[in-house]
Interface confidence: medium
């Protein structure tokens, strides 16, 4: 069982590349929706929950028309990277209550990472300017209580759901311009 072949595959049509990224984003959106519902079943949310360290929603769906591809991908990458760090943090510091969301939360982390890598490669294949290296992220403070961890989980999954929904719409719209 030797290693896989080394050379990268020939660059496919950017529209096909974007299609596969949309598929991956839709799949992750479905995972997130399911996990958020699971969380609500176990720990019903009392109103909306926010976390100051989460990115603000990139754009309302109505404002998508003015977007350009580099801006969408750069912003999406930055926001999803923030959510990846928050999911990692949640799994480390969220407390025993959130262990009931495993292994689904771990699967979500791995798929989110895969989507980020796909976006990065898409930016490379489309010859878009690469963002500068991310500075080391400041560590997130642990939740003050078990309930604080649950509130954080509601905020993270809810925000990720909105971001991925925006991403699918944005990527589909941009595909028509390629």
């Amino acid at each position: 069982p030797g290693p896989p072949p080394g050379p990268p595959r020939v660059s496919p049509d950017p529209r096909a590349e974007l299609d596969s990224t949309v598929l991956l984003t839709r799949s992750l959106l479905a995972d997130t929706r399911q996990l958020a519902a699971q969380l609500r079943d176990k720990f019903p949310a009392d109103g909306d929950h926010n976390l100051d360290s989460l990115p603000t929603l990139a754009m309302s769906a109505g404002a998508l028309g003015a977007l350009q591809l580099p801006g969408v991908l750069t912003r999406l990458r930055a926001d999803l990277l923030s959510y990846l760090r928050h999911v990692q943090w949640l799994r480390r510091a969220g407390g025993s209550s959130l262990k009931t969301l495993e292994p689904e939360l771990g699967t979500l982390q791995a798929r989110l990472d895969r989507l980020l890598r796909r976006l990065q490669l898409l930016m490379s294949r489309l010859a878009l300017p690469q963002p500068p290296p991310d500075p080391p992220a400041p560590p997130l403070a642990p939740p003050s209580s078990a309930w604080g961890g649950i509130r954080a989980a509601h905020a993270i999954l809810g925000g990720l759901h909105l971001t991925l929904d925006w991403a699918v719409r944005g990527l589909l719209l941009l595909k028509t311009r390629l």
Partner: antibody, heavy 123, light 110 residues
Framework: QVQLQQSGGGVVQPGRSLRLSCAAS????????MHWVRQAPGKGLEWVAV????????YYADSVKGRFTISRDNSKNTLYLQMNSLRAEDTAVYYC????????????????WGQGTLVTVSS | QSALTQPRSVSRSPGQSVTISCTGT?????????VSWYQQHPGKAPKLMIY???KRPSGVPDRFSGSKSGNTASLTISGLQAEDEADYYC??????????FGGGTKLTVL
């Protein structure tokens, strides 16, 4: 066969700079991502940086971010590590290493390593 | 990223089996099936022995095998031989283009 020939190590004072090189042969260099990994004396391995096959994507360990720059010249089959603002804790043997394959980045595992070059940061 | 945890040293007699553990967290070993193992003889460059948790590159004897359970990966060497005496390092992908290595395990074949 795959060969990674390293050079550029030596003794340098804290705060100064050094550039390491890694000349590749025996494979199509421009088709492979590359890592730098280091090993402090008597210690374990530490990942430092990675670069994609075409040089467009670069990532760094937090411990070197903003000080080290990984780059490559595919026309010369050479990988580089520019190290600025060096500190005593950067003292280590530095290895360049080839990634097994690069497509969607599922295979970022190292399959071949250079012989290593020692960097000593001391006043 | 913190280093993965490995035993500092293990020793066995020739012909015996040994298992070296590598414990990480839910953010690295526990999430990603990208664990590799390297063998390093003194003064030499590391050599890939296992990748993607349990796959063996061509040329590596089938005495070497890898597995993973939860946040812990393991390397098992059966039928130990004198030339297996070396340092062994595990490595895990740790999310969005970062990797973390273990501190290393010195294997002594008595």
């Amino acid at each position: 066969q795959v060969q990674l020939q390293q050079s550029g190590g030596g003794v340098v004072q804290p705060g100064r700079s050094l550039r390491l090189s890694c000349a590749a042969s025996g494979f199509t260099f421009s088709s492979y991502g590359m890592h730098w990994v280091r090993q402090a004396p008597g210690k374990g391995l530490e990942w430092v940086a990675v670069i994609s096959y075409d040089g467009s994507n670069k990532y760094y360990a937090d411990s070197v971010k903003g000080r080290f720059t990984i780059s490559r010249d595919n026309s010369k089959n050479t990988l580089y590590l520019q190290m600025n603002s060096l500190r005593a804790e950067d003292t280590a043997v530095y290895y360049c290493a080839r990634i097994m394959g690069y497509d969607y980045g599922d295979y970022d595992v190292v399959d071949y390593w250079g012989q290593g070059t020692l960097v000593t940061v001391s006043s | 990223q913190s280093a993965l945890t490995q035993p500092r040293s293990v020793s066995r007699s020739p012909g015996q089996s040994v298992t070296i553990s590598c414990t990480g967290t839910s953010s690295d070993v526990g999430t990603y099936n990208y664990v590799s193992w390297y063998q390093q003889h003194p003064g030499k460059a590391p050599k890939l022995m296992i990748y993607d948790v349990s796959k063996r590159p061509s040329g590596v004897p089938d005495r070497f095998s890898g597995s993973k359970s939860g946040n812990t990966a393991s390397l098992t060497i059966s039928g130990l031989q004198a030339e297996d005496e070396a340092d062994y390092y595990c490595c895990s992908y740790a999310g969005f283009y970062t990797w973390v290595f273990g501190g290393g395990t010195k294997l002594t074949v008595l």
